[in-house]
């Protein structure tokens, strides 16, 4: 009789452990759901606030007409700068006009002062032609002022209100550019 009672007690205890385990799993599952819900709500809020503000440029980017610009706070070589911009869904700055050049140099003066900033301009090793990264040629007024004496690949950068050239492997700040979002109003 005593053996029977102890067997039942052990079975009950086993059941209790299983229930506790199930409860723990359920609590964990509930916590996971709550966390997912939080992310989902955050995403929804972000989307809604973006829709309300319809901000054409991301935070910390500067807008001018149809473009958004990001001025880096780190130095890197030209190729790494390009990679950094691509990760943001942008490319190194491509200056299309004198007006855009003036805006950029004016903004840089306000933000940082007279530093070097890589732009998306590089010199073809064979022909010596300057080309933007999309393969187009810069307008005559937007060619680097001095030819770099480097035997290595040569890339373009902005300093003060000039476009200059340097060995692509030197370290500089950089400027990314992407299209501004059009407001759908």
């Amino acid at each position: 009789k005593l053996l029977q009672v102890s067997t039942i007690a052990m079975q009950q205890q086993e059941k209790l452990i299983q229930q506790e385990r199930a409860l723990l799993n359920f609590t964990e599952w509930k916590r996971s759901c709550a966390l997912q819900m939080k992310y989902c709500q955050a995403f929804m809020q972000n989307s809604l606030s973006s829709a309300h503000n319809s901000s054409p440029c991301p935070n910390n980017w500067i807008q001018n007409r149809e473009s958004c610009y990001y001025v880096s706070e780190i130095w890197s070589i030209w190729h790494t700068s390009q990679e950094n911009c691509l990760k943001e869904g942008s490319t190194l700055l491509q200056i299309e006009s004198k007006e855009e050049m003036d805006f950029i140099t004016g903004s840089l003066r306000k933000i940082k002062g007279s530093y070097d900033y890589w732009v998306g301009l590089s010199q073809d090793g064979h022909s010596g032609r300057w080309l933007w990264q999309d393969g187009s040629s810069p307008s005559p007024g937007l060619l680097p002022a001095e030819r770099s004496q480097s035997a290595n690949q040569v890339c373009g950068y902005v300093k003060s209100n000039s476009l200059l050239s340097s060995n692509c492997s030197t370290w500089k700040y950089f400027i990314c550019e992407k299209y501004a979002l059009r407001s759908s109003v």
């Epitope: 992310y39 955050a42 995403f43 972000n46 691509l86 990760k87 943001e88 869904g89 942008s90 490319t91 990264q133 999309d134 393969g135 550019e177 992407k178 299209y179």
Partner: nanobody, 121 residues
Framework: QVQLQESGGGLVQPGGSLRLSCAAS????????MGWYRQAPGKQRELVAA???????VYADSVKGRFTISRDSAKNTVYLQMNSLKSEDTAVYYC???????????????WGQGTQVTVSS
């Protein structure tokens, strides 16, 4: 996780053409840019061409005027049309996506397995 499937590599004569395709699949929140990189034996992997989600395009100096990158956003596919191929273009070509897997994750590089392009007579 983002999966990238390349196709279109092969053996071609100098001056010939090839078209590479890369389809992105899997679960991801957004893709900021897709592109092609290549690695020749004994050399570092280098960017060939890339296209951002906004449609901006980047080419390596060595391929400007010969290669054209394009995309089909609806299919999450990127293409590389390679014309006037040279022996220097011989390499393994890798598809790349700069993507965020979720709303809270940072943008990371995802890579395909690579497809061999050999330019030889």
């Amino acid at each position: 996780q983002v999966q990238l499937q390349e196709s279109g590599g092969g053996l071609v004569q100098p001056g010939g053409s090839l078209r590479l395709s890369c389809a992105a699949s899997g679960r991801f929140f957004r893709v900021n840019a897709m592109g092609w990189y290549r690695q020749a034996p004994g050399k570092q992997r280098e960017l060939v061409a890339a296209i951002t989600n906004g449609g901006q395009i980047v080419y390596a100096d060595s391929v400007k005027g010969r290669f054209t990158i394009s995309r089909d956003s609806a299919k999450n596919t990127v293409y590389l049309q390679m014309n006037s191929l040279k022996s220097e273009d011989t390499a393994v070509y890798y598809c790349n996506a700069k993507a965020a897997a979720s709303y809270v994750s940072t943008v990371a590089d995802y890579w395909g397995q690579g497809t061999q392009v050999t330019v030889s007579s």
